[in-house]
């Protein structure tokens, strides 16, 4: 079942899903000057069975100035450079997040996609929080939130994280030290956005992997 609301907002923190449960929707959004093709997919869907999950549907964007011309979904080299996916992260391949039964990994970018990714999570989804650059984490408990179903309604658990204004970045669970982004991009201070940056993450599977976080809005 879809979660009604967004994960909680923590001041000066961002959140990220390490893997997406089946039923998760990712809206097909296009960057400024481009639009979803008229009969194109509305969203990508994490779908599959207990042994294998993948993203169904393809997002396609077309120039809003040009009629009836569709852009291919293969990312261009400059976009690949700008938006690193897990596959391009390092010589050592990370554990496939889709190997967590019933979960999909971060979907690859499509050409001219929007700067924000809008996900719609399902019950049981877990997201992890970290403080944005320039803030330090004070943990009172797990820095994560889970969408749960209680009495027929969905709710997100409250992450036990406070970000204080000290010039020291915090880490995701199990992370020793965050790595600097190759592009040197600063993280967003908007609490509901997750910006492009690289760091090591310990997943629910207790596998450490490098991942790239796209600018994301969850709404």
């Amino acid at each position: 079942e879809l979660c009604d609301d967004d994960p909680p907002e923590i001041p000066h923190a961002t959140f990220k899903a390490m893997a997406y449960k089946e039923g998760t929707m990712l809206n097909c959004e296009c960057k400024r000057g481009f639009r979803r093709i008229k009969s194109g997919s509305l969203y990508m869907l994490c779908t599959g069975n207990s042994s294998h999950s993948s993203w169904d549907n393809q997002c396609q964007c077309t120039s809003s100035a040009t009629r009836n011309t569709t852009k291919q979904v293969t990312p261009q080299p400059e976009e690949q450079k700008e938006r690193k996916t897990t596959e391009m992260q390092s010589p050592m391949q990370p554990v496939d997040q889709a190997s967590l039964p019933g979960h999909c990994r971060e979907p690859p970018p499509w050409e001219n996609e929007a700067t924000e990714r809008i996900y719609h999570f399902v019950v049981g989804q877990m997201v992890y929080y970290q403080c944005v650059q320039g803030y330090r984490a004070l943990h009172r408990g797990p820095a994560e939130s889970v969408c749960k179903m209680t009495h027929g309604k969905t709710r997100w658990t409250q992450p036990q994280l406070i970000c204080t204004g000290e010039m020291e970045t915090s880490q995701f669970p199990g992370e020793e030290k965050p790595q600097a982004s190759p592009e040197g991009r600063p993280e967003s201070e908007t609490s509901c956005l997750v910006t492009t940056t690289d760091f090591q993450i310990q997943t629910e599977m207790a596998a450490t992997m490098e991942t790239s976080i796209f600018t994301t809005e969850y709404q």
């Epitope: 929707m25 809206n27 959004e29 639009r35 509305l42 969203y43 169904d56 924000e116 719609h120």
Partner: antibody, heavy 114, light 107 residues
Framework: HVQLQQSGAELVRPGTSVKISCKAS????????LGWVKQRPGHGLEWIGD????????NYNEKFKGKATLTADTSSSTAYMQLSSLTSEDSAVYFC???????WGQGTSLTVSS | DIVMTQSQKFMSTSVGDRVSVTCKAS??????VAWYQQKPGQSPKALIY???YRYSGVPDRFTGSGSGTDFTLTISNVQSEDLAEYFC?????????FGGGTKLEMK
């Protein structure tokens, strides 16, 4: 929570125009396609078209081109549908609906009568 | 335009029964199908997206299935509050189209 609040019932004369509004709340209005649906007894549900407020992009069902005009005001998170050259065939309940994940307004009843 | 056909306009059922509402698309729509429930005087309420996934707050007695051209909404252990009209909708290609509806009635 996502809410779509539509304007009240309308009774109008044939040949005139009407503008129905749909005020969105509980989500980022500019980030979602918002559609309009017509419902008439015996005719089921018909998709009129949809608009992406973030860019003002629109899609129209060919059947409603020239009849419906979709607009959006991002400052008030309100979408509008104007229906022109009204006839009795336009008498129906009109719904606005966020395209995905789906969420519908309560509907606006339009009666075209002389 | 893609035609969505709900061959049964009415279906009779009793509380506790299991009932299946069917919908057939005139061409392949993948799994891009939604199901809605509409009660008199109300707006349609979304039950299912992508043929088989439930929206939040939808009881698990509602199950969607199918892909391609044939789709089914199954209501197991029918409750009195389930008496309503049910519509399928395809959003695989534009314009998005709806089935004619199936009204669930009490025997």
């Amino acid at each position: 929570h996502v809410q779509l609040q539509q304007s009240g019932a309308e009774l109008v004369r044939p040949g005139t125009s009407v503008k129905i509004s749909c005020k969105a709340s509980g989500y980022t209005f500019t980030n979602y396609w918002l559609g309009w649906v017509k419902q008439r007894p015996g005719h089921g549900l018909e998709w009129i078209g949809d608009i992406y407020p973030g860019g003002g992009y629109t899609n129209y069902n060919e059947k409603f081109k020239g009849k419906a005009t979709l607009t959006a005001d991002t400052s008030s998170s309100t979408a509008y549908m104007q229906l022109s050259s009204l006839t009795s065939e336009d008498s129906a309940v009109y719904f606005c609906a966020r395209v995905t994940p789906a969420s519908w307004g309560q509907g606006t009843s339009l009666t075209v009568s002389s | 335009d893609i035609v969505m056909t709900q061959s049964q306009k009415f279906m009779s059922t009793s509380v506790g029964d299991r009932v299946s509402v069917t919908c057939k698309a005139s061409q392949n729509v993948g799994t891009n199908v939604a199901w809605y429930q509409q009660k008199p005087g109300q707006s349609p309420k979304a039950l299912i997206y992508s043929a088989s996934y439930r929206y939040s707050g939808v009881p698990d007695r509602f199950t969607g299935s199918g892909s391609g051209t044939d789709f089914t909404l199954t209501i197991s252990n029918v409750q009195s509050e389930d008496l309503a009209e049910y519509f399928c909708q395809q959003y695989n290609s534009y314009p998005y189209t709806f089935g004619g509806g199936t009204k669930l009635e009490m025997k």
